[in-house]
């Protein structure tokens, strides 16, 4: 049995944000279908996305079982009408993905400023602790619960009337900063994992300014 009409997948790429993890590949199938397998270094391969014509497979359910493990996926190609067909080595044609360690590599999603509250010359800025798809004891963990102190937030803030930015950092989800009385400020935050070598920073959050809905002012 041959696979003369079948081509191996290529450009296998992990797309992952806050642990939502999808494997993408090429080419768009012509008379062929794909099945994906994923494994940790244990070699216990688990099949997903059986005989699909998609060129992506959501592997979130597998990687969230242990985000600190390193995973490898492989994409098998089969002729559309004969999924039992094997290649010259007696097994279906397949290609391996790069290795992927979710804890070290998942992109940090764009954070959101949940609220800010001014009390005199202090402003407390709170970053929303986004829920991830990582579970523990049946409940979904937040980004902070997964990363702990490995995750910091950087706050950029500036007077609405000027462009000079100041920064503050926190390893919680709250900032307490000093501001000038009577001035309105704008805020943006960024998630950072300093210990990482790749994907260290998220994109900046949308800018929120004092005098808008999210804020609260108290003398």
């Amino acid at each position: 049995s041959g696979t003369t009409n079948t081509v191996a997948a290529y450009n296998l790429t992990w797309k992952s944000t806050n642990f939502k993890t999808i494997l993408e590949w090429e080419p768009k199938p012509v008379n062929q279908v794909y099945t994906v397998q994923i494994s940790t270094k244990s070699g216990d391969w688990k099949s997903k996305c059986f005989y699909t014509t998609d060129t992506e497979c959501d592997l979130t359910d597998e990687i969230v079982k242990d985000v600190k493990q390193t995973y490898l996926a492989r994409v098998f190609s089969y002729p559309a009408g004969n999924v039992e067909s094997t290649g010259s080595a007696g097994e279906p044609l397949y290609e391996n993905s790069p290795e992927f360690t979710p804890y070290l590599e998942t992109n940090l999603g764009q954070p959101t400023i949940q609220s800010f509250e001014q009390v005199g010359t202090k402003v407390n800025v709170t970053v929303e602790d986004e829920r991830t798809l990582v579970r523990k004891n049946g409940t979904f963990l937040t980004l902070r619960q997964v990363f702990g102190k490995d995750l910091i937030y950087t706050l950029y803030y500036w007077k609405s009337s000027s462009s000079g930015k100041k920064t503050a950092k926190t390893n919680t989800n709250e900032f307490l900063i000093d501001v000038d009385k009577g001035e309105n400020y704008c805020f943006s935050v960024q998630a950072v994992i300093p210990s990482r070598t790749v994907n260290r920073k998220s994109t900046d959050s949308p800018v929120e300014c004092m005098g808008q809905e999210k804020g609260e002012f108290r003398e």
């Epitope: 270094k41 244990s42 070699g43 216990d44 097994e91």
Partner: antibody
């Protein structure tokens, strides 16, 4: 320190059986596939068998299929190779190896010698 | 099965030499290739995996390259400790080793 220590080798007659063991330490045993590789005297390396971390997947070289059985006991951090119907050509040093994904071998034991002779 | 052919089978070289060993696969194995070093009476030692990834603790004078069917292991400046036999291994389809290349003192 990651260590693998093979045992169970020896002299056996053709048609006989032998069980090799490999004691692992220094890593989470069940997190890794493991394998056996052999080397006949003066020859190159030959892959024999691989087993996944759970023990649920096993693979064999054609030369040993049906005669050898790989297994593991994760509670004892030990890998096994049951060798039956041994032949003269099975004479070799048998190495146990840690095998991420069951693909390549990143840690090897020192080896145990199996001699099949009458 | 995928066959792996190494050349040369023996290589004579001197300390300080740049040494290149070739491994050819009978069909494309992408980058799924490892290189090992073995000294007499000792177990093999992993040097390179995924064709070009250097194993932790291996000196940087060792490097691997290639993809598809042709691969090379290069030792940029041969050291006394490097005289040994080197094996390639494919893991695209099950596992097969090359026949080995013995690097000996010229």
């Amino acid at each position: 320190e990651v260590q693998l220590l093979e045992s169970g080798g020896g002299l056996v007659q053709p048609g006989g059986s032998l069980r090799l063991s490999c004691a692992a330490s220094g890593f989470t045993f069940s997190d890794y596939a493991m394998g056996w590789v052999r080397q006949a005297p003066g020859k190159g390396l030959e892959w024999v068998s691989t087993i996944s971390g759970s023990g649920g997947l096993t693979y064999y070289a054609d030369s040993v299929k049906g005669r050898f059985t790989i297994s593991r006991d994760n509670s004892k951090n030990t890998l096994y190779l049951q060798m039956n119907s041994l032949r003269a050509e099975d004479t070799a040093v048998y190495y146990c190896a840690k095998a991420p994904y069951g693909y390549y071998m990143d840690v090897w034991g020192k080896g145990t010698t199996v001699t099949v002779s009458s | 099965d995928i066959q792996m052919t190494q050349s040369p089978s023996t290589l004579s070289a001197s300390v300080g030499d740049r040494v290149t060993i070739t491994c050819r696969a009978s069909q494309s194995i992408s980058s799924w290739l490892a290189w090992y070093q073995q000294k007499p009476g000792k177990a093999p030692k992993l040097l390179i995996y995924k064709a070009s990834s250097l194993e932790s603790g291996v000196p940087s004078r060792f490097s691997g390259s290639g993809s598809g069917t042709e691969f090379t292991l290069t030792i940029s400046s041969l050291q006394p400790d490097d005289f040994a036999t080197y094996y390639c291994q494919q893991y695209k389809s099950y596992i097969t080793f090359g026949g080995g290349t013995k690097v000996e003192i010229k």
